[in-house]
Amino acid sequence: THLGIRLPLRSGLAGPPLGLRLPRETDEESEEPGRRGSFVEMVDNLRGKSGQGYYVEMTVGSPPQTLNILVDTGSSNFAVGAAPHPFLHRYYQRQLSSTYRDLRKGVYVPYTQGKWEGELGTDLVSIPHGPNVTVRANIAAITESDKFFINGSNWEGILGLAYAEIARPDDSLEPFFDSLVKQTHIPNIFSLQLCGAGFPLNQTEALASVGGSMIIGGIDHSLYTGRLWYTPIRREWYYEVIIVRVEINGQDLKMDCKEYNYDKSIVDSGTTNLRLPKKVFEAAVKSIKAASSTEKFPDGFWLGEQLVCWQAGTTPWNIFPVISLYLMGEVTNQSFRITILPQQYLRPVEDVATSQDDCYKFAVSQSSTGTVMGAVIMEGFYVVFDRARKRIGFAVSACHVHDEFRTAAVEGPFVTADMEDCGYNIPQTDESTLMTGRA
């Protein structure tokens, strides 16, 4: 993913105290790999700012150089700034690392807008607020970039957590997570809880606030309520899944389900918005407009450009519908649905109106590269990337923003036939034509 409509990192509200959490609805203990229960050292290890990405602290080299790294499930390279740049406070200095090894190979990654290029090498990497291990990993040292780093975002690199198939320059470059699992006893699973603020943050609050958790090697039960529902990873490149039905306030969009996955549907922590294929986006917006017709909003708002402002604390959440995506289940002809609130798809934006107003951007947008379940979706849920079992789990996040009337939900099972037909089969083309940009 790269931030074009990149993800909001709206730092997070902590979840309720454990005593207030909903009980597990079912016991899936035996089905989940990895360490059980508490990963207290990894909780709250993500930070960030609205629309600019969630990042984790990492160290690279010997002696360790500390960098903030964007967590991106929509790409597969570990790449860090390695030369001075106006937007970087610090960067990886290979010459200061006694453990750096040059691979004598370059890498060039173009996006729809912008690019980065660099030199490949390996070095020792660890995650201070992660597992207590150090691994030798491939690193792309970014020497030149355009519209990649973001002014004030506070991150200096990107951690691509997807599969080798989409790594650059080719799939022979082992991604960080593969290296981590190979070189340690850490189970092949990680999970993300991205916590949106739900209200505009001023500069100070945004810098200070917690963004969420990346749990490496398992699942932390304190981060979600209810049960986890799993959808198969269709193919190990992006984290590709299959959407079988879409509803707005319970009203089926009634489209051929192939449209929902044209040309793919992915879970991408490095994208801000819920991005939908053109036809689906148009139908969804029409339906959302109809549901919220007591008020009319400008065309530019639905394009994600204009911001709508309300008196602080008076945002009429109730006039906006919920959005439900039905995902293929693990059992034949069974699906489950994830439901997000306007508190997820209206993204708070700071510094535009007076302090007496709350202003929001519409964070559902059009895509030419398939559905992208970005932060707008992920901020509602605890998302488990169970690579070992080739599945992705969703449960209601303990930190999601909601009101007294509605909450995000993960519900099932639902009977859905012929779900395999919902997947789109991309015609095989030369790998160099793959779209890298997710703007």
């Epitope: 017709s293 007591t294 008020e295 009319k296 909003f297 530019g300 450009e305 402002c309 535009v352 109106a353």
Partner: antibody, heavy 120, light 108 residues
């Protein structure tokens, strides 16, 4: 051709409530394509947005005036109204009613304006 | 809050001359900017919307340009009726609310 016409008293006493009505002729206030609003201009000064209203009665107000302003709509009379309470001399201005068009983002049609003086 | 600053405050020109008016936003407003003309004793009228689109009935000598934070209203050749006050207004934040302080174009 659609026209807007403000009406109401030209003189209001301090601490009282200013009340103005805008009558829409040549078109319907119930159109889904527009909001309707009020803008004022103190003598010799710039333009200040007061607030806007949709046919459903949904309103938006200038934060600096919010505690004193009420805008309402009467679709049966094709009118919308402004009430501004607890007025002072600083509220003396020409008050314009406007249509908010062009993607409900710009003030594309204006009434002629009415001068309201706040004085005892 | 987005603040619009217009310059110059007053522009003294002769008929037939070219007028260039500036409006600067304190942060990007994309292309969501309009220009209005107000003659003495009259209500303002919309000239340009979305930075560069002429409103209905506006002569071609009026043109708008710019995006982001810097915008320009150009009157290619001033006619006697063009001497007036010009205001810019942004609508990136909605409902539309923010006007610039105005530029007076007067006869030299």
């Amino acid at each position: 051709q659609l026209q807007l016409q403000e009406s109401g008293p030209g003189l209001v006493k301090p601490s009282e409530t200013l009340s103005l009505t805008c009558t829409v002729s040549g078109g319907s206030i119930s159109s889904s394509s527009y909001y309707w609003g009020w803008i004022r201009q103190p003598p010799g000064k710039g333009l200040e947005w007061i607030g806007s209203i949709y046919r459903s009665g949904s309103t938006y107000y200038n934060p600096s005036l919010r505690s004193r302003v009420t805008i309402s709509v009467d679709t049966s009379k094709n009118q919308f109204s402004l009430k501004l309470s607890s007025v002072t001399a600083a509220d003396t201005a020409v008050y314009y009613c406007v249509r908010v068009g062009h993607g409900i983002s710009y003030f594309d049609l204006w009434g002629r304006g009415t001068l309201v003086t706040v004085s005892s | 809050e987005i603040v619009l600053t217009q310059s110059p405050a007053t522009l003294s020109l002769s008929p037939g001359e070219r007028a260039t008016l500036s409006c600067r936003a304190s942060q990007s407003v994309s292309s969501y900017l309009a220009w209005y003309q107000q003659k003495p004793g009259q209500a303002p009228r919309l000239l340009i919307y979305d930075a560069s689109n002429r409103a209905t009935g506006i002569p071609a000598r009026f043109s708008g340009s710019g995006s982001g934070t810097d915008f320009t209203l150009t009157i290619s050749s001033l006619e006697p009726e063009d001497f007036a006050v010009y205001y810019c207004q942004q609508s990136l934040t909605w409902p539309p609310r923010t006007f610039g302080g105005g530029t007076k174009v007067e006869i030299k």
